[in-house]
Amino acid sequence: PPRGRILGGREAEAHARPYMASVQLNGAHLCGGVLVAEQWVLSAAHCLEDAADGKVQVLLGAHSLSQPEPSKRLYDVLRAVPHPDSQPDTIDHDLLLLQLSEKATLGPAVRPLPWQRVDRDVAPGTLCDVAGWGIVNHAGRRPDSLQHVLLPVLDRATCNRRTHHDGAITERLMCAESNRRDSCKGDSGGPLVCGGVLEGVVTSGSRVCGNRKKPGIYTRVASYAAWIDSVLA
């Protein structure tokens, strides 16, 4: 089943997010991803936890998952590199780099997204864009077309309240508000984009969606710049 968590959002403008990837297992959408280099897609490590024997592929240039589109192309994965410290039972270090079988054919609908290298928190209240093909309601309806929502960043101290995430949010994670608008199941691994720069990746822990007391949790890419650079090198 798809992992992670867009509720309360709307359909994205087609191909306006050319960095957006669908990580697929046996031909079905599993998680979001983001093209960070010509041959590399960044996603969440937990996405591949249950993918042991399945065929993992990456869809780029897509708006609709099912309809033919000139820019769409499915790439095989040459190498999957989860963060070495990621573990099944924690949300920490939930990053995965997927090396495509070949360099992506770039164009208006397929283009890498610059990612944040300066390890400084995004200011609370900043509106950031999260997109994905994750479920759009509590009944679990999966969209065919890419959805997105703008979410305000939430400060870490609030996010760490006992009623919220009770101390689980380290400096390597960030939160965004989740009051009816939220990332949801199937959005994991997708990008949180602030000011046109990739700041976070949707974590793939199981979490209730759209509840203001359970904010969305995102892995801060700037905190993993050294690791990302070392894998891409």
Epitope: R156, A157, R162, D166
Partner: antibody
Framework: QIQLVQSGPELKKPGETVKISCKAS????????MNWVKQAPGQGLNWMGC????????IYADDFRGRFAFSLETSASTAYLQINNLKNEDMATYFC????????WGQGTTLTVSS | SIVMTQTPKFLLVSAGDRVTITCKAS??????VAWYQQKPGQSPRLLIY???NRYTGVPERFTGSGYGTDFTFTINTVQAEDLAVYFC?????????FGGGTKLEIK
């Protein structure tokens, strides 16, 4: 290990000002709000409010608006409670406690108000 | 403000007894209730959070239950070291109000 260490006992006169400190160690100070709790002699616990250590924004319970102020010295990982124009009813033990991620309390600061 | 009405105020029990303390919230606080123990001259100590979760290192004889407005805290087999005052607290919304406390005395 995680610790909250409060300043020592205070003896003040009515009308004076007191500032109680709560120094945190063993964790990233700005990751957790700090609560302040009042306990009058022989009485129960009274949540005064809290301060968001990340943004600096305080929240005060209704009974603690006006003469009471929470502040931070982030570089020293320290939260402060200041009480102005002290009254006899302010005589109590004041506790700081970390909000979330476990159970961490200061040892308490006893304030005596006497003319 | 949400009022937390805690009963009883005092309990006189013998070692080995089962003790039940209740807290009633003036409006729903879902499961956002904690229970604290405070021994004389000490800071409060968290025993139960989210109404029923036992905090790390807390003995199994301490249990909590409830949802919405009605909450119960139980000590299954009271021991001499349980002499203390017990408080409930709601952290559903600010102000994060406490109950009035229950003083537990051992015969």
């Amino acid at each position: 290990q995680i610790q909250l260490v409060q300043s020592g006992p205070e003896l003040k006169k009515p009308g004076e000002t007191v500032k109680i400190s709560c120094k945190a160690s063993g964790y990233t100070f700005t990751n957790f709000e700090m609560n302040w709790v009042k306990q009058a002699p022989g009485q129960g616990l009274n949540w005064m409010g809290c301060i968001n250590t990340y943004t600096g924004d305080p929240i005060y319970a209704d009974d603690f608006r006006g003469r009471f102020a929470f502040s931070l010295e982030t570089s020293a990982s320290t939260a402060y409670l200041q009480i102005n124009n002290l009254k006899n009813e302010d005589m109590a033990t004041y506790f700081c406690s970390r909000e979330g991620g476990g159970d961490y309390w200061g040892q308490g600061t006893t304030l005596t108000v006497s003319s | 403000s949400i009022v937390m009405t805690q009963t009883p105020k005092f309990l006189l029990v013998s070692a080995g007894d089962r003790v039940t303390i209740t807290c009633k919230a003036s409006q729903s606080v879902t499961n956002d209730v904690a229970w604290y123990q405070q021994k004389p001259g000490q800071s409060p100590r968290l025993l139960i959070y989210h109404a029923s979760n036992r905090y790390t290192g807390v003995p199994e004889r301490f249990t909590g239950s409830g949802y919405g407005t009605d909450f119960t805290f139980t000590i299954n087999t009271v021991q001499a070291e349980d002499l203390a005052v017990y408080f409930c607290q709601q952290d559903y919304s600010s102000p994060r109000t406490f109950g009035g406390g229950t003083k537990l005395e051992i015969k």
